[in-house]
Interface confidence: low
């Protein structure tokens, strides 16, 4: 067959859909790979062709668009399942071509089963709510394009297995779920079930997301360096191991990059001719405040090293801070026979 620009298998788009529910999947070519949109391609005489490879098979097959009740159909650049079946799982390819041009991309589609409490292997999006922050909402995701605006669906919200009704601080409002005030106890999986009619049939869309209650920006502070501090002196003899922990607390901040780093005499450790290792550990609180510890280690410290300046730095979207460690060379304990004797004038 003639050459085709093959974008390969787009594993970034690991599409998961529930069994026995409608699914609409846009050809990724126009969203991620090509400059032009479907209508431009179509008006230029290009044709969009769909085919697939079943799970655990190598054979590429055309998609059967002649199934009863038009179960699988294509509309412009969208592949429709009304509804999906488990054995629709496989790698799907959309190919755009005419006599002189060809471009194609494949993507995996997984049809998954759910139980009566909406548990499934589906990867869930996470929605973060600020703790005790006032009214916040989550919206039933990925339901656009399934039904026209003239159709009024019914929406039912669940927390875990339980239908949300008469909850103290959580109120269903159609496609939105409002949290009057969010607490840690609101952490969990929330599911909206959207039911709509189409051509005499009733379809359900199930969408689950994880709500995580996080620290509020009202309480956010710049990074706090707990260690090093003024109360601890790192006193070492040459040849000993020097270990200095830098422990920093970061308030949760949405989309903030938390950074901790050491400088030695104002330079990065990599730029200093010393054998330094730095090990980092990270822990999180229930509201995703973060504590980062970076331990600076010099296996065999020299007297030169003990004269250097060791500074721990931290930065978040709230600001930047720094703290120097107090490092000293230990004065050796006097040996009586020499030092003290000399002190008493012995010869």
């Amino acid at each position: 067959s003639e050459r085709c620009d093959d974008w390969g298998l787009d594993t970034m788009r690991q599409i998961q859909v529930f069994e026995d529910e409608p699914a609409r999947i846009k050809c990724p070519l126009f969203e991620h790979f090509l400059k032009f949109n479907y209508s431009t391609a179509h008006s230029a005489g290009l044709t969009l062709i769909w085919y697939w490879t079943r799970q655990d098979r190598d054979l590429e097959e055309p998609i059967n668009f002649r199934l009863p009740e038009n179960r699988i159909s294509k509309e412009k650049d969208v592949l429709w399942f009304r509804p999906t079946l488990l054995n629709d799982t496989g790698n799907y390819t959309c190919m755009l071509r005419n006599t002189t041009y060809c471009s194609k991309v494949a993507f995996p589609l997984e049809v998954v089963q759910k139980d009566s409490c909406f548990n499934s292997p589906m990867k869930l999006p996470v929605h973060k709510l600020y703790i005790e922050y006032g009214i916040q909402r989550i919206t039933c995701p990925n339901v656009d394009g399934y039904f026209p605006s003239s159709v009024k669906p019914t929406i039912t919200w669940y927390m875990g297995c339980y239908k949300i009704q008469n909850f103290n601080n959580v109120i269903p409002e159609g496609m939105n779920l409002s949290f009057l005030i969010a607490f840690i106890s609101n952490n969990g999986n929330y599911t909206c079930v959207v039911t709509y009619p189409e051509n005499g049939r009733t379809f359900h869309l199930t969408r689950t997301l994880t709500v995580k209650v996080v620290g509020s920006p009202k309480n956010a502070v710049p990074p706090v360096i707990h260690s090093p501090n003024d109360h601890v002196v790192y006193e070492k003899e040459p040849g000993e191991e020097l270990l200095i922990p830098c422990t920093v607390y970061f308030s949760f901040l949405m989309d903030s990059r938390n950074e901790v780093w050491w400088t030695i005499d104002g330079k990065k450790p990599d730029d200093i001719p010393i054998d330094v290792t730095i090990n980092e550990s990270i822990s999180h609180s229930r509201t995703e405040d973060e504590t980062r510890t970076q331990i600076l280690s010099i296996k065999k410290v020299t007297s030169e090293d003990l004269k250097r300046s060791y500074v721990c730095h931290a930065r978040s979207a709230k600001g930047e801070v720094a703290k120097a460690a107090t490092v000293k060379q230990k004065v050796p304990a006097p040996r009586y026979t020499v030092e003290l004797a000399c002190g008493f004038g012995a010869t």
Partner: antibody, heavy 119, light 108 residues
């Protein structure tokens, strides 16, 4: 790194035509639009038209329709803009610009070609 | 066609000051397809902002864009010497693509 390299300066007589080339190097050529923008001395920027090389069909601003021909040669990764029936007010720097993959905006520009129309 | 009007025509400021450039469209700009370009004398324009507010690759964060519909703003938080140039807005959502007349940012 994609670069757009344009042909050299031209001096033309009124009524004649000029053809400016724009060669893309270091990236995919055919799937991004190449547009042409001109700038008269001391003036602002004016869009003339563009082409998506894989389709070969160009669109242009109404002001230039009938006078401008925009083409592309996929084999050499080169776009061309030909302007006919030149008049003195066509004296300008002509730029080609790539309509970017991520941005849809002109994220890459040629260095410009000065076209002087003078009798 | 969408006409873009930029104001002011010239902005006289000192390094370190904040610059606010305005771009008004005669019709709503579709899909927020509005870009800002910088042009220094004798050079080709350079893309600063696309999609109203998204910084292009390599553009420092002192440049920011905002707005929607018909009113858009380019802000330079602290002017550096290299920022003194002409700035153009452009809509690329509907044909013909159009540019504003430009705002010259000059040293006071």
């Amino acid at each position: 790194q994609v670069q757009l390299l344009q042909s050299g300066a031209e001096v033309k007589k009124p009524g004649s035509s000029v053809k400016v080339s724009c060669k893309a190097s270091g990236g995919t050529f055919s799937i991004y639009a190449i547009d042409w923008v001109r700038q008269a001395p001391g003036q602002g920027l004016e869009w003339m038209g563009g082409i998506i090389p894989i389709f070969g069909t160009a669109n242009s601003a109404q002001k230039f329709q009938g006078r401008v021909t925009i083409t592309a040669d996929k084999s050499t990764s080169t776009a061309y803009m030909e302007l006919s029936s030149l008049r003195s007010e066509d004296t300008a720097v002509y730029y080609c610009a790539r309509n970017g993959a991520t941005s849809d905006a002109f994220d890459m520009w040629g260095q410009g070609t000065m076209v002087t129309v003078s009798s | 066609e969408i006409v873009l009007t930029q104001s002011p025509g010239t902005l006289s400021l000192s390094p370190g000051e904040r610059a606010t450039l305005s771009c008004r469209a005669s019709l709503s700009v579709s899909s927020n397809y509005l870009a800002w370009f910088q042009q220094r004398p004798g050079q080709a324009p350079r893309l600063l902002i696309y999609g109203v507010s998204r910084r292009a690759t390599g553009i420092p964060d002192r440049f920011s864009g905002s707005g929607s519909g018909t009113d858009f703003t380019l802000t330079i938080s602290r002017l550096e010497p290299e920022d003194f140039a002409v700035y153009y807005c452009q809509q690329y959502g509907s044909s013909p693509l159009t540019f504003g007349g430009g705002t010259k940012v000059e040293i006071k």
